[in-house]
Interface confidence: low
């Protein structure tokens, strides 16, 4: 019968001919009376056999990631009679893995959006690298993820690639972060290969800033001839937030005379001071009112940022008009 062990050849072998093993018939007494032949895909080009001894060699560098298995056939013939000594037999050569592929992030580019001020532990995104090496061969394709850039705001779970928030972030200070993740094979042992990816993490706005008046005092004038409903000037607050979180409502906080009103221009986010009652220079030639500004939408959980509304003082001078 045929005698052989399982055949393995390491991929990427640099030797010009690498001895894989020996195929022989147990009838072969070593007197060179038998001839061994190799048939099938790769025979003669990738693999050769010593016709006298049955020793098999690989004569080409093999890439396991391209092809991991070769199925060949062996024959043994008695040189004197030309007859087969053994029935033709099929055998397998397996290409064994070496760690020659670095992990690759195939879903790049990564981008995620997370609300600013999210608590520690909030899941941002999961990045996944794949390694073309053999997952069943040692640790060649066992990956560990680590953070190269992004501390102290982000962390990555070493075995899953899940990125989480590790420190609260304020969009008004920085609205996006570049996180660099490394995936290392061989579970980080010597000889490990690595790949990196960048993750753009954008912070979405939450209403964590109240509007604040740019001026603590505004001076306006109104003619005593102005009819009610006249716009006598504008006031403006600044809100570090954006979008609907920066929409604001102006209102009167103090106006003993009840002469003025403030309406909000929701296009420009300005407060328009309106004359509610006609004024009379001879009766009162100046007024002092206090205005306040608040955000339009403030979720309950963000009320702590909006405890005291910003206020401003408005001095209004009445202009005299000659009366007949």
């Amino acid at each position: 019968g045929w005698v052989w062990n399982q055949f393995f050849v390491p991929e990427e072998m640099n030797t010009t001919s690498h001895h894989i093993g020996q195929l022989r018939s147990d009838l072969d007494n070593g007197n060179n009376s038998f001839q061994y032949k190799l048939l099938g895909a790769g025979a003669g080009s990738t693999f050769i056999i010593d016709e006298r001894t049955g020793d098999i060699y690989a004569i080409q560098k093999l890439d396991r990631e391209e092809r991991s298995l070769y199925i060949l056939r062996a024959q043994v013939i008695d040189i004197a009679t030309g007859r087969a000594v053994e029935p033709e037999s099929e055998f397998v050569i397996k290409v064994s893995d070496i760690n020659d592929n670095e992990p690759k992030f195939l879903d790049e580019p990564y981008e995620a959006i997370v609300p600013e001020m999210s608590p520690e532990g909030t899941l941002v995104i999961q990045v996944t690298a794949s390694d073309a090496d053999d997952p069943s061969s040692g640790n060649n394709a066992r990956l560990l993820y680590s953070l190269l850039q992004g501390q102290p705001y982000f962390s990555v779970e070493p075995t899953t690639g899940v990125i989480r928030i590790s420190s609260k972030m304020d969009r008004e200070l920085q609205d996006e972060y570049w996180v660099i993740i490394q995936a290392k094979d061989m579970i980080g042992q010597p000889g490990a290969l690595s790949g990196t990816t960048s993750v753009l993490i954008k912070l979405s706005d939450v209403n964590d800033n109240k509007p604040i008046f740019k001026e603590s005092l505004y001076r306006l004038t109104v003619s005593e001839s102005a009819p009610t409903g006249t716009s006598i000037g504008t006031i403006m607050a600044y809100d570090n937030d954006i979008g609907e979180n920066a929409e604001m409502d102006y209102s009167i906080e103090e106006d003993d005379s009840q002469t003025f009103d403030i309406i909000t221009n929701h296009e420009t986010q300005e407060g328009i001071v309106i004359l509610k009652k006609k004024v009379d220079f001879e009766h009162q030639n100046h007024y002092g009112i206090r205005a306040k500004v608040k955000n339009h939408h403030v979720p309950e959980q963000l009320m702590k940022y909006h405890t005291e509304a910003s206020t401003t003082f408005i001095k209004i001078q009445v202009e005299d008009v000659d009366e007949p």
């Epitope: 200070l173 996006e176 570049w178 740019k214 570090n240 954006i242």
Partner: antibody, heavy 120, light 110 residues
Framework: QVQLVQSGAEVKKPGASVKVSCKAS????????MSWVRQAPGQGLEWMGI????????TYAQKFQGRVTMTGDTSTSTVYMELSSLRSEDTAVYYC?????????????WGQGTLVTVSS | QSVLTQPPSASGTPGQRVTISCSGS????????VNWYQQLPGTAPKLLIY???QRPSGVPDRFSGSKSGTSASLAISGLQSEDEADYYC???????????FGGGTKLTVL
Amino acid sequence: QVQLVQSGAEVKKPGASVKVSCKASRYTFTSYYMSWVRQAPGQGLEWMGIIHPSGGDTTYAQKFQGRVTMTGDTSTSTVYMELSSLRSEDTAVYYCARGGIKLWLHFDYWGQGTLVTVSS
Amino acid sequence: QSVLTQPPSASGTPGQRVTISCSGSRSNIGSNFVNWYQQLPGTAPKLLIYTNNQRPSGVPDRFSGSKSGTSASLAISGLQSEDEADYYCAVYDESLQGWVFGGGTKLTVL
């Protein structure tokens, strides 16, 4: 982290022009203003002007009006500052600095600076 | 002559508290947010305090800013040798329609 990388040092003769570049990366280039600030040897910081890269809107300091031109190229995320009719007093380190999303918000990131020497 | 006035120099011994003032007018400090920059020798300026009193991440809480009316100040407590640098205040000026810097204050740690 936001990065602003400026072009290298220049030596110019009086009357010539200089064009300094500032390449931005790792943020949305078109969202933020970019200012140019200079610093003469041993002197303080002097604001020259500001550009919004998305529309190319510019505001220049009165002192540099007519001599300075700021431009932006959104395809390469680069802003440029050109100063003409150079004189020896223009010898300085020129910095680009990223502004805010509003004209009056702080400069949070600065380039490494470009030394421009004006000498005959 | 700068639009914003700062003392040209300030000094203190390690551990001490020093304050640098910045005086302006209604059209700049009186109307807008004050920012402070630190410039270590031979390097580009770095944002130290923004919108009057906010610290960017990485800036120690030894640095604090405040504003009142048309003046602002930067306070450094627990002074350290690495704080030796030039400090500039900066603000947007509504009248000039542009940014203005203080003349800078050279801080020496004795």
